[in-house]
């Protein structure tokens, strides 16, 4: 059998393999050692017994989408049946005091690979033996502690494969410079040690995307905006636009990035090198926001010019390019810059909102029949912008962290936006008061610290804004 027979549904085309050469990966035309690595079809009954105590699930994730030329990283995590975990030696053990369907296990080990490898024979002086090899026959790399790595992962994409020895989690990074744009499929098959051979325990696949567009996300936030995710914002208050470029491999780290904004309100184009920008809309309505991100990124470099002719030497002549259709020469150090672009577009709605709220006066309400340890205080509040429909007060400790009391109530305010909010305080002391005025789209906050005196006629109320 060949790798593509084992790993894929269909043999990849020569076109696909030629157009997507991955550095350090091998052609899936290579032979697969089925004696050492048995191949089971989906639905084969042997899968049921491939792992003690249930099935192992492999979870494959990637940091896709990847800008062409950058690295994309794939991570495989093995999820063991309940109560099982990998220990520091790479053995699979039962978690202490964990009950599964079989109850508590007397044997601490699910798989004690250390014990097996210590009494393993048939090895030469290098610790290498005929079974410490990958499915294509390549020997395992002898990193320190390689014996604690008991899983073999075979990654397969674009007609090529990559083999890795690992523990219950592995990561593989692939450079996408030679990958065709668009969605691609990554498939991973996982084997575990089993005596002098290996047993398949899981298969998983995931789609990843290689793109020529810089992946761009924009977060929009605004003080007093009630719902930041509905793309409705308030007039006359700055909106903060923060651009996040999805670049997990830091491909654009050394690039100068330009942000070109059009806010759709006839204020023209705004070009910035800062990923954060503020903009204030002064009219109500619906506006089309457009952002173009431009970055000079490393791109494909032309091959170096041929060296000048030398005096003839008895060396074999090289045929024209194409004689070896799968030959790849070394990539030189040139830094060939090309412009990459990313785009973001959003439609945002601008409405009236409460822009500002201020407490202009606080008054101790003298009660004819004072309650025990209870004070009533009036807060005289003004606001700017639209008319609020509700008022909320949160009374908390002086650090403004421990809430003692929260009250919200509807409110009817005149055009002048002047209202009095009366609240009760239990006992004397210093309080933090958060006062919020709200309507459908906005929520404006002000805070103050007040000192409530003892119930002594001579004492007065103090407010520190």
């Amino acid at each position: 059998k060949r790798f593509h027979d084992v790993l894929g549904n269909e043999r990849p085309s020569a076109y696909m393999r030629e157009h997507n050469q991955l550095n350090g990966w091998s052609s899936d035309e290579n032979d697969w050692n089925e004696k050492l690595y048995p191949v089971w079809k989906r639905g084969d009954m042997r899968w049921k017994n491939s792992w003690k105590g249930g099935r192992v699930q492999a979870v494959l994730t990637s940091d896709s989408p990847a800008l062409v030329g950058s690295n994309i990283t794939f991570v495989v995590n093995l999820v063991f049946p309940r109560c099982q975990k990998e220990d520091a030696n790479g053995n699979i053990v039962y978690e202490k005091n964990c009950r599964n369907e079989a109850g508590l296990s007397a044997d601490p080990y699910v798989y004690n690979w250390t014990a097996w490898s210590e009494d393993s024979d048939g090895e030469n002086g290098t610790g290498q033996s005929h079974h410490n090899v990958f499915p294509d026959g390549k020997p395992f790399p002898h990193h320190p502690g390689w014996r604690r790595w008991n899983f073999v992962y075979v990654f397969h994409t674009l007609g090529q494969y990559f083999q890795k020895l690992g523990r219950c989690s592995v990561r593989v990074s692939v450079n996408t410079a030679n990958v065709t744009l668009g969605p691609q499929l990554m498939e991973v098959t996982v084997y575990r040690r089993h005596g002098r051979a290996y047993v398949p325990i899981a298969q998983v696949k995931d789609v990843y995307v290689v793109t020529d567009q810089i992946p761009v996300f924009v977060t929009m936030s605004q003080k007093n905006d009630r719902n930041s995710s509905d793309e409705t914002f308030l007039k006359d208050l700055p909106i903060t636009f923060d651009v996040l470029i999805h670049d997990p491999s830091h491909f654009l780290n050394y690039s100068t990035i330009n942000y070109k904004w059009s806010f759709g309100d006839n204020t023209g184009l705004f070009v910035s090198i800062n990923h954060t920008v503020n903009h204030t809309y002064v009219l109500n309505g619906t506006f089309s926001l457009n952002l173009t991100v431009k970055a000079a990124a490393p791109g494909p470099c032309p091959p170096p010019p041929p060296p000048p002719p030398r005096p003839p030497k008895p060396t074999p002549s090289l045929g024209p390019a194409g004689d070896n259709p799968l030959g790849l020469s070394e990539i030189p150090d040139e830094n060939c810059q090309i412009n990459r672009y990313g785009h973001f577009q959003a439609t945002i709605t601008i409405v009236e909102g409460i822009l500002e709220v201020n407490i202009i006066q606080t008054t101790d309400v003298l009660m004819l029949v004072p309650g025990p340890d209870s004070s009533l205080i009036d807060f005289v509040v003004t606001c700017q912008g639209s008319i609020p429909t509700e008022v909320c007060t949160i009374i908390s400790d002086p650090t403004c962290e421990i809430t003692q009391n929260a009250v919200c109530s509807p409110v009817d305010v005149d055009e002048m936006c002047l209202l009095t909010v009366r609240r009760a305080f239990n006992g004397s002391g210093t309080y933090c008061v958060n006062l919020t005025l709200g309507d459908d789209t906005s929520l404006a906050l002000t805070s103050t610290l007040i000192s409530v005196p003892d119930r002594d006629p001579a004492s007065s109320l103090r407010m520190a804004n």
Partner: antibody, heavy 117, light 107 residues
Framework: EVKLVESGGGLVQPGRSLKLSCAAS????????MGWVRQAPGKGLEWIGE????????NYTPFLKDRFTISRDNAQNTLYLQMSKLGSEDTAIYYC??????????WGQGVMVTVSS | DIQMTQSPSSMSVSLGDTVTIPCRAS??????VNWFQQKPGKSPRHMIY???NLADGVPSRFSGSRSGADYSLTISSLESEDVADYHC?????????FGSGTKLEIK
């Protein structure tokens, strides 16, 4: 809109050389392999060859590779086909085509090359 | 080299008909087959990829199918604008090869 425009064709005498150009626009030229295909009058299409993004891999149809050379200039968004020792059997319309996930997803309008004395 | 055989070289059809254009590969090419439409005096247009998938912007009356080494392009309810040459092409192996084409003509 993807656009490929060939130029450089015309009448050429047998045994002579000719260089065709293909100007690309509407896509990131440097992100794609590019290819050449020809079509003799009244005949089917024939693949000539292809070049990868950075010009390091060039594949030809075997019987043409000694006389035809494909190159590209990413800075100019241009693909080239250098043809030498032309014969009457090379009379054809020459098309440049973009190669994406599959070959030849977009084609130029073609340029006629007539080899005659 | 892999031969792609298109026979017949021309087909006479009526508007509104369902037409099936065949193509046979000389060896296994899996599903790696493209179909192209070429109107008189024009350059080819990509219609079908991977034997059965419609390329961008291609009307849904076009479809592709595969049975072993036999591939076909079907046009349901033929329209006058569909009169053209149709070429199949394999990309399983190098060199990439085309069929000789099938010309659709109106009766």
């Amino acid at each position: 809109e993807v656009k490929l425009v060939e130029s450089g064709g015309g009448l050429v005498q047998p045994g002579r050389s000719l260089k065709l150009s293909c100007a690309a626009s509407g896509f990131n030229f440097y992100d794609y392999w590019m290819g050449w295909v020809r079509q003799a009058p009244g005949k089917g299409l024939e693949w000539i060859g292809e070049i990868n993004k950075d010009s390091r891999t060039i594949n030809y149809t075997p019987f043409l590779k000694d006389r035809f050379t494909i190159s590209r200039d990413n800075a100019q968004n241009t693909l080239y086909l250098q043809m030498s020792k032309l014969g009457s059997e090379d009379t054809a319309i020459y098309y440049c085509a973009r190669e994406g996930r599959v070959p030849f997803d977009y084609w130029g309008q073609g340029v006629m090359v007539t080899v005659s004395s | 080299d892999i031969q792609m055989t298109q026979s017949p070289s021309s087909m006479s059809v009526s508007l509104g008909d369902t037409v099936t254009i065949p193509c046979r590969a000389s060896q296994d090419v899996g599903s790696y087959v493209n179909w192209f439409q070429q109107k008189p005096g024009k350059s080819p247009r990509h219609m079908i990829y991977r034997a059965t998938n419609l390329a961008d912007g291609v009307p849904s009356r076009f479809s592709g199918s595969r049975s072993g080494a036999d591939y076909s392009l079907t046009i349901s309810s033929l329209e006058s604008e569909d009169v053209a040459d149709y070429h199949c092409q394999q990309y399983a192996e190098y060199p990439l090869t085309f069929g000789s084409g099938t010309k659709l003509e109106i009766k």
